[in-house]
């Protein structure tokens, strides 16, 4: 059997944050957006992903994890420059593929230690291990061309299905939900929203079934749709009213009266 | 219908080994859609999960850190079938075992579970 | 290790009142589009374990729909619209968001 080595328990330190706000704890804010920000973590003295919710909140959060470490984590750019000559590969990226316990498709990339580079892998959508990237480059930077040997997160940093092959264009009725052919649909222009909310339903890859809500750009209203699972896309809410708060204000009506509310 | 059998010794001496095995039916062991867990209960520390095996494109194990030096957990695909062993073997790990299936494809969850196996450790 | 804290620890109840029990992680347990991944289940006594929900708020296949779950990255609530008298037992919250997977330490639901 193929026994990953252990990244659950780890020593913590006692370095002081640079900020007061580093020491703030993650606060995702009362909306419900669905936007992936990043906090420095007091207890692990690590910059971690988190949701922000896309109003209030709190300083502790960063657009991305290299502000967050340049922001918070003390000596972080000089330890960055100081290791880019000849740094070593973090510990993780001689982990075995792991697929992790469930069975989303997703679509990621792990460092292969027999060919020295990194490579496409289809991971599962939850648990697995930490030799697991969102993007090539990303894994290239850490794992093949390592500038400097960044502060590893405690799991997996989970990123948007994948939906290869599986993503619904064009058609006029999805999960049995007929889309009226409108007249008055709203061209791609006139919708200054999050992009996401311009694509079809879809209804994912597994075999669950699941009451989710679609925002339908061309009646500017939230539909239900049965949701499978995984895979899919981010028109996927919870409720009809997170999807017409997340997609409704992008819908610009009237030039005079700007976005509704 | 999965159903899980559990079988094994209800008594073990200390610093000997605990052995469980849990027999399969309606499912199988290599499954790609499924993963095998030991998880125990004890009044003191409520549910405690101790690891997991599933087989994807090979055979894949994690272990709770409390029990990683102790434990094994391996399928038999022969008899259709997964056992846990856990050696040096103290009080502390007096409990009710159960072998549970968690579901891979839909319900990311335990789903079924074994009846339960009460194993006191005691001389 | 994410810790998984319930409250209240003991739950007496009235058949046909409402009950909640409240989940809460120490990190989050969200995921893309909603999905959080943290489970509840229900042990009746002398039983095993069953799963009740999963990721948060789907019930399992044959769990009557007065179970409903809530919540969002780290506080999460099972409710039951009218509680029955086969709906006695403990309740457990589990995340798997990151190993080990862990539980909650249960809340005991009992009848008046």
């Known amino acids: 059997l193929s026994e990953e080595a252990d990244d659950t328990d780890s020593e913590l330190g006692s370095m002081k944050p640079l900020h007061t706000f580093c020491a703030m704890k993650a606060d995702d804010g009362p909306c419900k957006a669905m936007i992936r920000s990043y906090f420095f973590n007091m207890y692990t003295h690590q910059c971690e992903e988190f949701i922000y919710g896309g109003c209030e909140g709190n300083e502790n959060r960063f657009d991305t994890l290299e502000e967050c470490k340049k922001t918070c984590i003390p000596g972080y750019e000089k330890t960055a420059v100081k290791a880019a000559s000849g740094a070593e590969r973090p510990d993780f990226c001689f982990l075995e593929e792991d697929p992790g316990l469930c069975r989303g498709y997703m679509k990621r990339y792990l460092y292969n230690n027999q060919t020295k580079q990194c490579e496409r892998f289809v991971y599962g959508g939850c648990l697995g291990n930490r030799n697991n990237f969102e993007t090539l480059d990303e894994c290239k930077k850490i794992c093949e061309n390592p500038v400097h040997s960044p502060s590893p997160v405690n799991e997996v940093q989970m990123s948007d299905y994948v939906t290869d092959g599986n993503t619904v264009t064009d058609r006029s009725t999805v999960n049995n939900i007929v889309v009226p052919q409108s007249p008055k649909v709203p061209r791609r222009r006139d919708y200054r929203g999050r992009p996401w909310c311009l694509q079809p339903a879809d209804s994912g890859l597994c075999k669950a079934s699941e009451r989710r809500f679609y925002y339908n750009s061309a009646t500017g209203k939230c539909h239900r749709f049965n949701y499978t699972g995984c895979g899919g896309n981010n028109n996927n809410f919870t409720t009809r009213r997170r999807c017409l708060r997340s997609c409704k204000t992008g819908l610009i009506k009237n030039k005079s009266k700007g976005v509704v509310k | 219908q999965v159903q899980l059998q559990q079988s094994g010794p209800g008594l073990v001496k200390p610093s000997q080994t605990l052995s469980l095995t849990c027999a399969i039916s309606?499912?199988?062991?290599?499954?790609?859609?499924?993963?095998w867990s030991w998880i125990r209960q004890s009044p003191g520390r409520g549910l405690e999960w101790l690891g997991i095996i599933y087989k994807r494109s090979k055979w894949y194990n994690r272990y709770a850190v409390s029990v990683k030096s102790r434990i094994t957990i391996n399928p038999d695909t022969s008899k259709n079938q997964f056992s846990l062993q856990l050696n040096s073997v103290t009080p502390e790990d007096t409990a009710v075992y159960y072998c549970?299936?968690?579901?891979?494809?839909?319900?990311?969850?335990?789903?079924?579970w074994g009846q339960g196996t009460l194993v006191t450790v005691s001389s | 290790d994410i810790v998984m804290t319930q409250s209240p620890l003991s739950l007496p109840v009235t058949p046909g009142e409402p009950a909640s029990i409240s989940c809460r992680s120490s990190?989050?347990?969200?995921?893309?589009?909603?999905?959080?991944?943290l489970n509840w289940y229900l042990q009746k006594p002398g039983q095993s374990p069953q799963l009740l929900i999963y990721?948060?708020?789907n019930r399992a296949s044959g769990v009557p729909d007065r179970f409903s779950g809530s919540g969002s990255g780290t506080d999460f609530t099972l409710k039951i619209s009218r509680v029955e008298a086969e709906d006695v037992g403990v309740y457990y919250c589990q995340q798997y968001t990151s190993y080990p997977l862990t539980f909650g330490q249960g809340t005991k639901v009992e009848i008046k």
């Open positions: 309606g499912d199988s062991v290599s499954s790609d859609s499924a993963a």
């Open positions: 990721k948060g708020s």
């Open positions: 990190q989050s347990l969200v995921f893309r589009f909603g999905i959080n991944y």
């Open positions: 549970a299936r968690w579901h891979s494809d839909k319900h990311w969850g335990f789903d079924d």
